[in-house]
C-alpha cells in the first residue's frame, strides 16, 4: 500500500497593498515548522481589486465593501477553512492615502475606518489597516527582495558557519516606483548617512545593516505627470498644450479642476483663463526629458551630495532591483534585459515617443488607451529619475535589474511588511541541528 501523505502543516498570511491607482491582495504561505528560516515564505496567490485606489472612494465610502469583496472571497477560497481564523490580514495604504491625509486627516480616517469594518467581516484574523510611511515602504521593499534573493541566508549549521552564497552576500538596493511616490533604499558603502531621517538600522539573522532610504512623495509616475502638466500649462499661451511626452497625433482634454485636485500640483497652481485644456502630443523624447528635469530642484543641497529637492543621497553602491512600475513600464517597452545599455534605452525611447499615436494604437491593439498613451512619458520619466534624480550613470545602469517576481513572489513592500509584523525575521541567526538541516527543502 502507498504511504498516505501527511497533511501539509502550513500557515498563511494576507496583505492588501492599497496603492494610489489600485489595490492588490497577496496571499503568502510557509511551512509552519520553518517560520524563522530565510526564504521559505512564498506568494501563493494574488488578486488585483477591480477599480481605482481606496483614496478615490472618499466621496463614496459606502462602496468600499463591495469593492473589496471579490478578492477577499477569492482569499477565502484559496485558504483552507481550518486555517481562516489564524490567518492574519494586514492592509497597508501608501502614497495615495498619504496625499489624501495631507488634504484632510478626517477624510483619510473615514476611508480607513470603512476599510477596517469591511475587512473585519471576513473569517480571518484581521490585524488592521493603516497608512504606512514612505520610510517603511522603502525598507519593506528592500527586505522583500533581499529575503527572496537569499541575501540574509547565512545559515548557521550545528557544526560550523557555511554561507550558502559564498561570494554573493552583498544586499541589493531597492528602487520602487508607484503612482504617487518612489522609494530608493540601499546599504551605502562605508558612508555616514548624513540625514537621520534617511537612516535605518536593522539586525537580521545575526547581521547588522545600516540602510539608507527615502520616499519622494509626488514623484510616482502618475503624480509626476500631473506635476509636469501643471508646470507646463503655466506658460501655455492658450488652452492647447503641445506636449513632447505624448505621441504625435495624440489628443486629450484635461479639466483644470482635476489638475489642481492633488496636493502635488499646489506649487504650480495659478488662475487660468480656461476651465479645460487640450494636450496635443508632439512626441519628442529630448524635449520631454528636459521638461521632466524641471521637476527636480538640484540648485540646493545642504549635504555632501543630494538626489534632488535638497534630499541627501549617498553614492550608489552595488546592484539594485527596480520593481513595481519600474518593471511594468520597462517590460512593456521591452527594455528589462540586463544587457540593454542606458544609451540603447535612450535611443529606443526616442524612437518610441516619435511613433505616431495611430500607429501605436494599431501595434498595441490589446492595451487600454489610457495606459498606452502614457508609456512615452513613463519611460522618459524613469530614465530621468534614475539618471538625473538618483545619479545612475551609463556604467552603473548595468547594475539595475528590472524585476517583476523573484521565486514566484512579487517584488514590493508587502512581503517584507508581513515578515516583520509576524516576527518572521529574527534578529539573531537561528541555529539548525543536524536533523532539521537534513530535512531542509
Amino acid at each position: 500500500t502507498q504511504n498516505k501523505a501527511l497533511p501539509e502543516n502550513v500557515k498563511y498570511g494576507i496583505v492588501l497593498d492599497a496603492g494610489s491607482s489600485h489595490t492588490s491582495l497577496y496571499i503568502y504561505k510557509w511551512p509552519a515548522e520553518k517560520e524563522n528560516d530565510t526564504g521559505v515564505v512564498h506568494q501563493s496567490a494574488e488578486c488585483r481589486v477591480k477599480g481605482p485606489g481606496i483614496s478615490k472612494f472618499v466621496q463614496k465610502v459606502n462602496e468600499i465593501g463591495i469593492y473589496l469583496t471579490d478578492c477577499m472571497e477569492a482569499a477565502r477560497e484559496a485558504i483552507p477553512r481550518s486555517q481562516h481564523q489564524e490567518t492574519p490580514v494586514y492592509l497597508g495604504a501608501t502614497a495615495g492615502m498619504r496625499l489624501l491625509r495631507m488634504e484632510s486627516e478626517e477624510l483619510a480616517d473615514r476611508v480607513l475606518d470603512v476599510v477596517e469594518r469591511s475587512l473585519s467581516n471576513y473569517p480571518f484574523d484581521f490585524q488592521g489597516a493603516r497608512i504606512i510611511t514612505g520610510q517603511e515602504e522603502g525598507a519593506y521593499g528592500w527586505i522583500t527582495i533581499n529575503y527572496l534573493l537569499g541575501k540574509f541566508s547565512q545559515k548557521t549549521r550545528w557544526f560550523s558557519i557555511v554561507p550558502y552564497e559564498t561570494n554573493n552576500q552583498e544586499t541589493f538596493g531597492a528602487l520602487d516606483l508607484g503612482g504617487a511616490s518612489t522609494q530608493v533604499t540601499f546599504v551605502p558603502q562605508n558612508q555616514t548617512i548624513e540625514s537621520p531621517d534617511n537612516a535605518l538600522q536593522f539586525r537580521l539573522y545575526g547581521k547588522d545593516y545600516n540602510v539608507y532610504t527615502h520616499s519622494f512623495l509626488c514623484y510616482g509616475k502618475d503624480q509626476a505627470l500631473w506635476q509636469k502638466l501643471a508646470k507646463d500649462i503655466q506658460v501655455a499661451s492658450n488652452e492647447i498644450l503641445r506636449d513632447p511626452c505624448f505621441h504625435p497625433g495624440y489628443k486629450k482634454v484635461v479639466n483644470v479642476s482635476d489638475l489642481y485636485k492633488t496636493p502635488c500640483t499646489k506649487r504650480f497652481e495659478m488662475t487660468l483663463p480656461f476651465q479645460q485644456f487640450e494636450i496635443q502630443g508632439i512626441g519628442n523624447y529630448q524635449q520631454c526629458h528636459q521638461s521632466i528635469l524641471e521637476l527636480f530642484n538640484t540648485s540646493y543641497c545642504p549635504y555632501s551630495q543630494c538626489a534632488f529637492n535638497g534630499i541627501f543621497l549617498p553614492p550608489l553602491q552595488g546592484d539594485f532591483g527596480a520593481f513595481s512600475a519600474f518593471y511594468f513600464v520597462m517590460k512593456f517597452l521591452n527594455l528589462t534585459s540586463e544587457k540593454v545599455s542606458q544609451e540603447k534605452v535612450t535611443e529606443m525611447m526616442k524612437k518610441f515617443c516619435a511613433q505616431p499615436w495611430e500607429e501605436i494604437k494599431t501595434s498595441y491593439a490589446g492595451v487600454k488607451e489610457k495606459y498606452l498613451s502614457e508609456y512615452c512619458f513613463s519611460g522618459t520619466y524613469i530614465l530621468s529619475l534614475l539618471l538625473q534624480g538618483y545619479h545612475f550613470t551609463a556604467d552603473s545602469w548595468e547594475h539595475i535589474h528590472f524585476i517583476g517576481k523573484i521565486q514566484g513572489s512579487d517584488a514590493g513592500w508587502t512581503l517584507g511588511y508581513m515578515l516583520n509584523l509576524t516576527n518572521m525575521i529574527p534578529a539573531e541567526q537561528p541555529l539548525s541541528t543536524p536533523l532539521s538541516h537534513s530535512t531542509y527543502v
Partner: antibody, heavy 118, light 108 residues
Framework: PVQLQQPGAEVVMPGASVKLSCKAS????????MNWMRQRPGQGLEWIGE????????NSNQRFKGKATLTVDKSSSTAYMQLSSLTSEDSAVYFC???????????WGTGTSVTVSS | EIVLTQSPTTMTSSPGEKITFTCSAS???????LHWYQQKPGFSPKLLIY???NLASGVPTRFSGSGSGTSYSLTIGTMEAEDVATYYC?????????FGGGTKLEIK
C-alpha cells in the same frame, strides 16, 4: 511537488505543424515565466523563447522567429509551443522549463522528442 | 548574442578528484545571470548552481560555483561516480538566453 509534464514523443510529416504541450502543477502557473529549449541529438541546448503566463508577453530567439509560437492556457496551467513548416532539421527533444529572476531554469519538463519523417 | 565557451569539451576523472569546469563569455555578464546545469544521458537538464554561486535545492554541497565578468567556473570538490554527466553554463543577461556547448565528464 513542482512538475512540468510533457508528452514523450511526436512523429510528424515534413511541412506539417505540431503543437507541444507542457502542463504545470505544484505551483502558481502565472507566477513564473515558461521557457522552451531545443536539443538536437547529441548536441547542446538552444533557447527558443519565453512567455509570461500572467499577461502572455513573449521574448523569443530570432533564430526561431516564424518557426515557434508560444501560448498558454491559464485555466489548465498549460504552456504550448507550436512549431510550423517542419523539416528534418527540427527533429529534436524540446524541453519546457520554469524561469526565475536571473533567467535560470529551476524546473524542467521531461521533454518531448519530435521526429520529422515521411 | 553572448557566446559562452566551455572548456574542455570532454574530461576524464577518477572518483575522489577535484574537478573544475570553466565557462568563458564573449562579453561581460553580471554574476546574477550565470547558471550551471547537469544533464545525464536520456534525462532533462537539472539546475545545479544559480546566480554564479548559489546551490540549487537538493544539490550536494560538493558542487560550488564562482566567477565574475567574463570568466566563471563550476567545481566538484570530490568527484563521485554519479557525477558522470554533461555540464552546461547558461547566461540570462541578454536576449537570446544562451548555453555553453557543454563539458562531458567521464569516469576513468
Amino acid at each position: 511537488p513542482v512538475q512540468l509534464q510533457q508528452p514523450g514523443a511526436e512523429v510528424v510529416m515534413p511541412g506539417a505543424s505540431v503543437k507541444l504541450s507542457c502542463k504545470a502543477s505544484g505551483y502558481t502557473f502565472t507566477s513564473f515565466w515558461m521557457n522552451w529549449m531545443r536539443q538536437r541529438p547529441g548536441q547542446g541546448l538552444e533557447w527558443i523563447g519565453e512567455i509570461d503566463p500572467s499577461d502572455f508577453y513573449t521574448n523569443s530567439n530570432q533564430r526561431f522567429k516564424g518557426k515557434a509560437t508560444l501560448t498558454v492556457d491559464k485555466s489548465s496551467s498549460t504552456a504550448y509551443m507550436q512549431l510550423s513548416s517542419l523539416t528534418s532539421e527540427d527533429s529534436a527533444v524540446y524541453f519546457c522549463a520554469r524561469g526565475d529572476f536571473g533567467w535560470y531554469f529551476d524546473v524542467w519538463g521531461t521533454g518531448t522528442s519530435v521526429t520529422v519523417s515521411s | 548574442e553572448i557566446v559562452l565557451t566551455q572548456s574542455p569539451t570532454t574530461m576524464t576523472s577518477s572518483p575522489g578528484e577535484k574537478i573544475t569546469f570553466t565557462c568563458s563569455a564573449s562579453s561581460s555578464i553580471n554574476s546574477n545571470y550565470l547558471h550551471w546545469y547537469q544533464q545525464k544521458p536520456g534525462f532533462s537538464p537539472k539546475l545545479l548552481i544559480y546566480r554564479t554561486s548559489n546551490l540549487a535545492s537538493g544539490v550536494p554541497t560538493r558542487f560550488s560555483g564562482s566567477g565574475s565578468g567574463t570568466s566563471y567556473s563550476l567545481t566538484i570538490g570530490t568527484m563521485e561516480a554519479e557525477d558522470v554527466a554533461t555540464y552546461y553554463c547558461q547566461q540570462g543577461s541578454s536576449l537570446p538566453r544562451t548555453f555553453g556547448g557543454g563539458t562531458k565528464l567521464e569516469i576513468k
